[in-house]
């Protein structure tokens, strides 16, 4: 089941998955001036068996101006530097989730890959939050969020993290202000409204990926 919701937004924090559950998709996105090769994969898919998980399919980009396909090579240093600018200021290693069964590691870059990586998470995926540079964490619990299925709808658990500016006066534990609900964020951890939604069960996803779903979303 794909997670049909946005992970929680924590002010002054970013998040990252340390590893990706089987079923996760990563779009094959190319940087400006490049496009996917005509016969190329639309996405990479984390698949596996009981002992090993890996990314199926390979992403390949070619210049928008030519018809030549490009080979998969390690990006040039400036390309690696460009990608690194999106990463967090200090490493986060709460757990070596990549060694867990049923998880894939971060896939290696491909030539002319876009600087943005677009993942489609599945139920059970965990992401870890960290305050951005210049802010420090006030923890009330785990700084992580998990995509869960509740009453037939997916939702992300709320990470217990507040990021405060270094110069701000910190509050004593237990006196932290409750996290404001972001605009538009449904706030319901326990209640279950029985309503008709446009959420569609997305079974046998991998089998149908290459067909009609890429113009309309999982019809």
């Amino acid at each position: 089941e794909l997670c049909d919701d946005d992970p929680p937004e924590i002010p002054h924090a970013t998040f990252k998955a340390m590893a990706y559950k089987e079923g996760t998709m990563l779009n094959c996105e190319c940087k400006r001036g490049f496009r996917r090769i005509k016969s190329g994969s639309l996405y990479m898919l984390c698949t596996g068996n009981s002992s090993h998980s890996s990314w199926d399919n390979q992403c390949q980009c070619t210049s928008s101006a030519t018809r030549n396909t490009t080979k998969q090579v390690t990006p040039q240093p400036e390309e690696q530097k460009e990608r690194k600018t999106t990463e967090m200021q200090s490493p986060m290693q709460p757990v070596d989730q990549a060694s867990l069964p049923g998880h894939c590691r971060e896939p290696p870059p491909w030539e002319n890959e876009a600087t943005e990586r677009i993942y489609h998470f599945v139920v059970g995926q965990m992401v870890y939050y960290q305050c951005v540079q210049g802010y420090r964490a006030l923890h009330r619990g785990p700084a992580e969020s998990v995509c869960k299925m509740t009453h037939g709808k997916t939702r992300w658990t709320q990470p217990q993290l507040i990021c405060t500016g270094e110069m701000e006066t910190s509050q004593f534990p237990g006196e932290e202000k409750p996290q404001a609900s972001p605009e538009g964020r449904p706030e319901s951890e326990t209640s279950c409204l029985v309503t008709t939604t446009d959420f569609q069960i997305q079974t046998e996803m991998a089998a149908t990926m290459e067909t009609s779903i890429f113009t309309t979303e999982y019809q």
Epitope: D6, F15, A114, R117
Partner: nanobody, 130 residues
Framework: QVQLVESGGGSVQAGGSLRLSCEAS?????????MGWFRQAPGKEREFVGA????????SYADPVKDRFTISRDNAKSTVYLQMNNTKPEDTAVYYC??????????????????????WGQGTQVTVSS
Amino acid sequence: QVQLVESGGGSVQAGGSLRLSCEASGRTLFSSYGMGWFRQAPGKEREFVGAISRFGTYTSYADPVKDRFTISRDNAKSTVYLQMNNTKPEDTAVYYCAAYTYSGSFYSTVKTHHDEYRYWGQGTQVTVSS
């Protein structure tokens, strides 16, 4: 990789309503992208109107349109909407739909600067007369 086509523009009296639509096509998942609306009046810079995150959880609006405009999306139809209520003459502009992606494995859920948007539609004219 993503083509965006706006529709629903036209003329409306001040105080009236208009609903703009933006349909995406291309071999990609619509829910890959956050979506935004921008507008450009004659002789002015293109300005942010509002945006919505991948699954519609988060929205953000420019101050001049807050409480009047509403953005929504239907991922099953690969379409994002801009509902314009209580329109004013200063809302007259060409309205553009745009798509943005997220950086790395991290999410800045709603983006407000036009430089952060990767794909753009051709625009649709909205004229509000007094």
